[in-house]
Amino acid sequence: MGRARDAILDALENLTAEELKKFKLKLLSVPLREGYGRIPRGALLSMDALDLTDKLVSFYLETYGAELTANVLRDMGLQEMAGQLQAATHQGSGAAPAGIQAPPQSAAKPGLHFIDQHRAALIARVTNVEWLLDALYGKVLTDEQYQAVRAEPTNPSKMRKLFSFTPAWNWTCKDLLLQALRESQSYLVEDLERS
């Protein structure tokens, strides 16, 4: 379990029930860095501190998850708690402008391809799906598969549909997807590679 995750959990568990409710509401409208999706409202509002910590880490990874949590705490006027959280994650204040992310600290699973290791983060964070489809069309994806992914209404659902075809892929097919990701969203791949 990462240090940042523990620090997020510690901060959220120290909120009163009313503060936790307020935290969730603010999380729905706090500006996010480019490339990050928002936790769906329905799922968010029913979560306890532990579930919310897990969701923050899966959606935003540990480092940005901690930074985002601190920003929401600031926006609640809980600056001391925000400071403690950032001190616990060794980030300091004002370190990086929006759009720059320090290496996340979550551990990757060994033996799996990058694509499989980071499935959840890719579903949540890939925004340029059409570009990926064009890169994979005719090499990895059939016309039917290509159209099926394109038909999905949102980027996360497009990515989920794309991942539904990956069990049949070999390592080389997955490498092609990784290469396409490197070309379309290099910052995202770099983030995940450092995790």
């Epitope: 307020k22 509401l25 603010k26 729905l28 409208s29 706090v30 500006p31 996010l32 860095r33 480019e34 990050y36 928002r38 601190a70 920003n71 600031r74 926006d75 609640m76 006027g77 600056q79 925000a82 400071g83 950032q86 204040s93 004002g94 402008p97 929006a98 759009g99 925004t127 949102t154």
Partner: antibody
Framework: QVQLQQPGAELVRPGASVILSCKAS????????ITWVKQRPGQGLEWIGN????????NSNQKFKDKATLTVDKSSSTAYMHLISPTSEDSAVYYC??????????????WGAGTTVTVSS | DIVMTQSQKFMSTSVGDRVTVTCKAS??????VAWYQQRPGQSPKPLIY???YRNSGVPDRFTGSGSGTDFTLTITNVQSEDLAEYFC?????????FGAGTKLELK
């Protein structure tokens, strides 16, 4: 009442840095984000960055990362924006605004009157 | 960056009319949109936040609506003091971005 006071105008030579000030009153300065916004004549609004006065944490627009530095002085409840090596492109009105922590929405409920910066030799 | 497109730079209206200002986001921003009014020589003034909530003190002739990518600001029974420029702003993602503005003019 809540106010953000800004000097009306600053004339600056090209390349000579300038520091714009924004004095807050009527609320707890350290609890609400201060945001800076640029408006060139006849053009739209551009977000430069936010600063949280309590701990000086900043979020900045990458476009302005080498152009503007945001700081605060808590003792005088004043926010500052340091414009670095200004050129004619930086001639604009610069507003400081407040994001009230009472609201969840990230909109700006109070605006200063703006400082008109003219970069000219 | 998320681009906020206000396709109409100018709109002509008469006192008492109903007018609709539109704003389109380049990607889904949920309801994380605000509207501002800027009169000539003044700073922007907040009208609407969270797409449809009026800021305190804003007359109820101003109504915001929309979600996802399409947003509207409707002014019913336009008054002479409403002749100004209107900007939309998204705060779903950094960098925060504004529309280019729509100027309301008398016919």
């Amino acid at each position: 009442q809540v106010q953000l006071q800004q000097p009306g105008a600053e004339l600056v030579r090209p390349g000579a840095s300038v520091i714009l000030s924004c004095k807050a009153s009527g609320y707890t300065f350290t609890s609400s984000w201060i945001t800076w916004v640029k408006q060139r004549p006849g053009q739209g609004l551009e977000w430069i960055g936010n600063i949280y006065p309590s701990d000086s944490y900043t979020n900045s627009n990458q476009k302005f990362k080498d152009k503007a530095t945001l700081t605060v002085d808590k003792s005088s409840s004043t926010a500052y924006m340091h414009l670095i090596s200004p050129t004619s492109e930086d001639s604009a009105v610069y507003y400081c605004t407040r994001k009230d922590f009472v609201y969840d929405a990230w909109y700006f409920d109070v605006w200063g009157a703006g400082t008109t910066v003219t970069v000219s030799s | 960056d998320i681009v906020m497109t206000q396709s109409q730079k100018f709109m002509s209206t008469s006192v008492g009319d109903r007018v609709t200002v539109t704003c389109k986001a380049s990607q889904n921003v949920g309801t994380n949109v605000a509207w501002y009014q800027q009169r000539p020589g003044q700073s922007p003034k907040p009208l609407i936040y969270s797409a449809s909530y009026r800021n305190s003190g804003v007359p109820d002739r101003f109504t915001g609506s929309g979600s996802g990518t399409d947003f509207t600001l409707t002014i019913t029974n336009v008054q002479s003091e409403d002749l100004a420029e209107y900007f939309c702003q998204q705060y779903n993602n950094y960098p925060l971005t504004f529309g280019a503005g729509t100027k309301l003019e008398l016919k």
